[in-house]
Interface confidence: low
C-alpha cells in the first residue's frame, strides 16, 4: 500500500515569501504524486511548483495560495491511490490602498463644524494597528477633536474645524510588516486665514543633468507665504541659493525648478505655506537621481526542436523600474503567438531549428537602456557524413577510423572499443572531426569498434570491424648475444609470427651446415652437448608465402660458469686493526671481481688509503672502525655469468686484560691476529 | 502485447501438491504488483494472493500456511506453491497484473 | 474482511436497454472499487477501475459510479455482445474481496 512518510501541514506563511508543502510517499511500486488545491488539480508555474514530491512556493500569494491543498499519491499500475491530509497556508500580508473621505459623501458637503470621517484603505492579516498622521506629524489617540477606531480603520474629527485642515496619511503595521497609504487625502476646511493646500509636490525621478519640477501651491486670505527648504534645512530662494542649489529657481506659482540635476541635488525637499493664521503647512517630496545598473550576462541556450522553452531575463535594479522586453533580428516579440514575451520570460514553443539565433533582453528607464544577447542553438540529431567503415590495419602502423558527422551544435564523438569506452592516451586520439587514430597498431586492436556522435537532440552510432595485417616479426626477437654453459645440454629458441604461420630455421652465419649433436626442432636450436666449437655466429630465418624472410643473427659464446675458488668468511677484527676478506673465482671467460660493501659498489679507483683490492680479488681495509662493520659481497663476473657470496664484518673494541688472565690467554672470539 | 500464460494445473489427491506457474512477457515484470485469484466451479471469484514487486507477499485466510506465492523476476515468472491440497480448493485459478491484465486460467482438481 | 454485497444476483433485459448493477462495501472503501466482465471458460476482463474509470479499450456505454460503501456499474445500452457476469471487486485493503456477481441474460 501506498504510505506517506511526510504529510503537508497547514503552516504561517509571508505573502511574496518561499514556502514548502512537504509530501513523501513510500509504495510497492512506481507513485505518481500530484497536487489539488480545493479539489483541482495544481499546474506547475515558475512560481508554485512540484519539487521531487513536494510543492513549492517561490513567493506565496494570498490570493492564489488560499484553499486546501492535498497531495495524491496514485500507483498506476494497480490504480491505487492516496490522498494526504488537507493543508492549507495561513497567510500573512500588508497591502497599501489609499486614504479616502468616508463621511460626508463628497469633499463637497464638507463644512466648518461638521464631522468628517477619514478611512485608511491598508489592509492585511493578521488586522494591522493603524497610525494616522497630519501633515506627517502623529496624530495620538485621545486628541482634543478627533477619535481613531482602529477596528474601522477610521479617523473621526468632531466637530472638523480649519485647525484640522492638511494632508492626512496613514501607517499601518502587522507580523508581516508595515505599509504606508498610497494616496493622501487633502482636507481643507475654510478658515480663509488658514493655509490651505492647492498643490501638494510628488516624488520625482530625473535622469542626471536633466530638470525636476516640484508643483507647490497654498491658498488663504492674506495670501500665504511659501518657502522651500533642502534636506539640511537650508532656504532655497532666488536670492539666497545654497552652494549645491546654484541652478534652483523658485517661480512666484510656488514651483521650484532645478536645472541639470546632480547626485548632490537628491534628496527630500519641503514646501512650507504660513498663513495668518493657523499653522504651517509642510509638505515633503523626494528628487531620486534615476539609474540602471548593468544586466548579467547569459549563458548560450541550447535546445532540442519540437520542446518548449524559457529564458527568464532578469532586469537590472534601477529606479525607476526598468521596462523589459525581448528582441529578435531587431524585432520586438509579441506577447502571444509562437515565439513570444510573457512577462520577463522569452518563451519558444514548439521550437523550430529557424528559432536558432540571437535574441536580446533590453532593459529602459530614464537613465538609460541596458540590452544582453542569449545565443539559442536548436540541436538537431546528427547525420552521417562518412560512417567507420570494416578496415584492414597494418600492425605498427597508424590506423584511422573515420566518423564524420554534422549538427548543431557540433557533435560530440566518442568511441568504444569492445564496448569499453577509449578514453584518449598516447595510443588513441580522437581527432576534432570524430576520426579515430590508433597510434601504432598492435595485435590485438582487432576487435570491433564503435562510434557514437551525440548532441543535446539525439545521437548515432555505427560499428565496424579492425581486422589487423600482422607483420612477419620475431616473437620475441633472439638475444643478440647468448651464452652457454661448456659441456652442458643448451638450447636457443626462436619464433616468429605473421599473416601466415611463418617457417623457422637455424644456420651458421658462415653457412656451414649444423653438427650433428646439434638439431633445429621447429625453430628451437637444441645443443645435446655443448663444445668449444659451437661457440660462433647463427643466424634464425622466419619465412612465408606473402612476407617473404626476415632474419635474426645470434652470436653464442661457449663458457665456463663461474665458481668461487675461495669464498669471504664471517670476520670478527678489533678495532684499529686490518681486516681481510679474501675471494676468489674461476670461470671462462675469466671473471673479474667486484666488491659491495653496506650496499654500495667499491669503486677501487676511489676506496682511499685504507681499502685495496688484491689481482686475486682479496679485499683489505686497514685500521678497521666501528662503521666498517657490515655485509661485504663479492661478485664475480663475466660476459655470460655473474654469482656473488657474502660474509658480515664485525669491529669490535679491544678488551682490556684482567689481571687473572695470563698473557697467553685467547681472545673471547674467533680474531684475524695482525 | 502484455501475455501471461499459464501451466501447472491437473489432478491431485487431498493432502497433494501443486505448483502452478505464470510466465509475464511484454512488460518490465519485475515492476509490477502479482495476484492470484480463483473461481470454483459455478462460484464467484476470490482473491487467494498477491506478491509485490519487492517481494512482500499477501494470503487470503482460507489458504495461509498452505499456499506460497514466489517469483523469479529473471525469468519473469510468478509462482504458486500449493501444499495440503483439500475439496475445496478445487477452481480454476487465475493470474493477473493488476487490475487490467489476466492469464487464460489453469484447472485444479482434486480428488481421491 | 470486507463483505461485497452486488445486486441483483441475476437480471433479464433486451438490446438497446439501459442496465444498472449495484455494488455494497460493508465498511468504506473510497473509491477502490474494480468491475469485471465474465464470460463462460473466459478469463474476467477489466472494465472499470477507481470506482468509475473506464479502462482502456472498453466501449464508452460502460460507466461506473460510486465512493464510500454504494456503488453502481451502469451499461446505456445493451449490446449482444454484453451477455455475461459482472463482478465487483474492492481493492481498498488486503484480502481484496469479490461481489458475488450478476448474471445478465437476454430477455
Known amino acids: 500500500a501506498i504510505v506517506f512518510i511526510k504529510q503537508p501541514s497547514s503552516q504561517d506563511a509571508l505573502q511574496g515569501r518561499r514556502a514548502l508543502l512537504r509530501c513523501e510517499v513510500e509504495a510497492p511500486g512506481p507513485v505518481h504524486v500530484y497536487w489539488l488545491l480545493d479539489g483541482a488539480p495544481v499546474q506547475d508555474t515558475e512560481r508554485r511548483f512540484a519539487q521531487g514530491s513536494s510543492l513549492s512556493f517561490a513567493a506565496v500569494d494570498r490570493l492564489q495560495d488560499s484553499g486546501t491543498f492535498q497531495c495524491v499519491a496514485r500507483d498506476d499500475v494497480t490504480g491505487e491511490e492516496a490522498r494526504s491530509a488537507n493543508a492549507s497556508f495561513n497567510i500573512k500580508w500588508i497591502e497599501a490602498g489609499p486614504v479616502v473621505l468616508k463621511h460626508p459623501a463628497s469633499e463637497a458637503e464638507i463644512q466648518p463644524q461638521t464631522q468628517v470621517t477619514l478611512r485608511c484603505h491598508i489592509d492585511g492579516h493578521p488586522r494591522p494597528t493603524y497610525q494616522w498622521f497630519r501633515d506627517g506629524t502623529p496624530l495620538s489617540d485621545g486628541q482634543s477633536n478627533h477619535t481613531v477606531s482602529s477596528k474601522e480603520r477610521n479617523l473621526t474629527l468632531r466637530p472638523a474645524g480649519p485647525e484640522h485642515s492638511g494632508l492626512y496619511s496613514c501607517c499601518a503595521h502587522s507580523a508581516f510588516g508595515q505599509a504606508c497609504s498610497s494616496q493622501n487625502f487633502t482636507l481643507s476646511i475654510a478658515d480663509e486665514s488658514f493655509a490651505r493646500v492647492v498643490l501638494a509636490p510628488q516624488d520625482v525621478v530625473v535622469a542626471r543633468y536633466e530638470e525636476a519640477m516640484f508643483h507647490c501651491q497654498f491658498s488663504a486670505q492674506p495670501p500665504p507665504s511659501l518657502q522651500w527648504l533642502f534636506e539640511d534645512e537650508t532656504p532655497i530662494t532666488n536670492r539666497s541659493r545654497p552652494p549645491h542649489l546654484r541652478r534652483a529657481t523658485v517661480f512666484a506659482n510656488g514651483s521650484l525648478l532645478l536645472t541639470q540635476v546632480r547626485p548632490r541635488n537628491a534628496g527630500i525637499y519641503r514646501c512650507i505655506g504660513q498663513g495668518q493664521r493657523g499653522p504651517p503647512i509642510i509638505l515633503e517630496a523626494t528628487l531620486h537621481l534615476a539609474e540602471i545598473e548593468d544586466m548579467p550576462l547569459f549563458e548560450p541556450r541550447v535546445f532540442t526542436a519540437g520542446s518548449e522553452e524559457r529564458v527568464t531575463c532578469l532586469p537590472p535594479k534601477g529606479l525607476p523600474e526598468p521596462s523589459v522586453w525581448w528582441e529578435h533580428a531587431g524585432v520586438r516579440l509579441p506577447t502571444h503567438g509562437r515565439v513570444y514575451q510573457k512577462g520577463h520570460e522569452l518563451v519558444l514553443a514548439n521550437i523550430a531549428e529557424s528559432d536558432a539565433g540571437v535574441y536580446t533582453c533590453h532593459a529602459a528607464n530614464l537613465a538609460g537602456q541596458r540590452r544582453q544577447d542569449v545565443n539559442i542553438t536548436v540541436a538537431t540529431v546528427p547525420s552521417w557524413l562518412k560512417k567507420p567503415q570494416d578496415s584492414q590495419l597494418e600492425e605498427g602502423k597508424p590506423g584511422y577510423l573515420d566518423c564524420l558527422t554534422q549538427a548543431t551544435p557540433k557533435p560530440t564523438v566518442v568511441w568504444y572499443r569492445n564496448q569499453m569506452l577509449i578514453s584518449e592516451d598516447s595510443r588513441f586520439e580522437v581527432f576534432k572531426n570524430g576520426t579515430l587514430r590508433i597510434n601504432s597498431v598492435e595485435v590485438y586492436d582487432g576487435t570491433w569498434y564503435r562510434c557514437m556522435s551525440s548532441t543535446p537532440a539525439g545521437s548515432i552510432e555505427a560499428q565496424a570491424r579492425v581486422q589487423v595485417l600482422e607483420k612477419l616479426k620475431f616473437t620475441p626477437p633472439p638475444q643478440p648475444q647468448q651464452c652457454m654453459e661448456f659441456d652442458k645440454e643448451a638450447t636457443v629458441p626462436c619464433s616468429a609470427t605473421g599473416r601466415e604461420k611463418p617457417t623457422i630455421k637455424w644456420e651458421r652465419a658462415d653457412g656451414s651446415s649444423l653438427p650433428e649433436w646439434v638439431t633445429d626442432n621447429a625453430g628451437t636450436l637444441h645443443f645435446a652437448r655443448v663444445t668449444r666449437d659451437d661457440a660462433g655466429n647463427y643466424t634464425c630465418i622466419a619465412s612465408n608465402g606473402p612476407q617473404g624472410q626476415i632474419r635474426a643473427h645470434v652470436q653464442l659464446t661457449v663458457a665456463v660458469f663461474i665458481t668461487f675458488k675461495v669464498e669471504p668468511e664471517r670476520t670478527t677484527v678489533y678495532q684499529g686493526h686490518t681486516a681481510l676478506l679474501q675471494c676468489e673465482a674461476q670461470g671462462d671467460p675469466k671473471p673479474l671481481i667486484q666488491w659491495k660493501g653496506k650496499d654500495r659498489i667499491l669503486d677501487p679507483t676511489k676506496l682511499g688509503p685504507r681499502m685495496h683490492i688484491f689481482q686475486n680479488g682479496s679485499l683489505v681495509i686497514h685500521d678497521v672502525a666501528p662503521e666498517d662493520s657490515g655485509r661485504y659481497t663479492c661478485i664475480a663476473g663475466n660476459s655470460c655469468n655473474i654469482k656473488h657470496t657474502e660474509a658480515p664484518l664485525y669491529v669490535v673494541d679491544k678488551p682490556v686484560p684482567e689481571e687473572s688472565e695470563g698473557p697467553g690467554s685467547p681472545p673471547p672470539y674467533k680474531m684475524i691476529q695482525t | 502485447e502484455v501475455q501471461l500464460v499459464q501451466s501447472g494445473g491437473g489432478l491431485v489427491h487431498p493432502g497433494g501438491s501443486l505448483r502452478l506457474s505464470c510466465a509475464g512477457s511484454g512488460f518490465t515484470f519485475s515492476t509490477y504488483l502479482m495476484y492470484w485469484v480463483r473461481q470454483a466451479p459455478g462460484k464467484t471469484l476470490e482473491w487467494v494472493s498477491a506478491?509485490?514487486?519487492?517481494?512482500?507477499?499477501y494470503y487470503a485466510d482460507s489458504v495461509k500456511g498452505r499456499f506460497t506465492i514466489s517469483r523469479d523476476n529473471a525469468k519473469n515468472s510468478l509462482y504458486l506453491q500449493m501444499n495440503s491440497l483439500r475439496a475445496e480448493d478445487m477452481a480454476v485459478y487465475y493470474c493477473a497484473r493488476g487490475l487490467g491484465y489476466w492469464g487464460q486460467g489453469t484447472l485444479v482438481t482434486v480428488s481421491s | 474482511d470486507i463483505q461485497m454485497t452486488q445486486s441483483p444476483s441475476s437480471l433479464s433485459a433486451s438490446v438497446g436497454d439501459r442496465v444498472t448493477i449495484t455494488c455494497r462495501a460493508s465498511q468504506g472503501i473510497s473509491s477502490w472499487l474494480a468491475w469485471y466482465q465474465q464470460k463462460p471458460e473466459k478469463a474476467p476482463k477489466s472494465l472499470i477501475y477507481?470506482?468509475?474509470s473506464l479502462q482502456s479499450g472498453v466501449p464508452s456505454r460502460f460507466s461506473g459510479s460510486g465512493s464510500g460503501t454504494d456503488f453502481t456499474l451502469t451499461i446505456s445500452s445493451l449490446q449482444p455482445e454484453d451477455f455475461a457476469t459482472y463482478y465487483c471487486?474492492?481493492?481498498?485493503?488486503?484480502?481484496?474481496?469479490f461481489g458475488q456477481g450478476t448474471k445478465l441474460e437476454i430477455k
Open positions: 471487486q474492492q481493492y481498498n485493503s488486503y484480502p481484496y474481496t
Open positions: 477507481a470506482a468509475s
Open positions: 506478491i509485490g514487486s519487492g517481494g512482500d507477499t
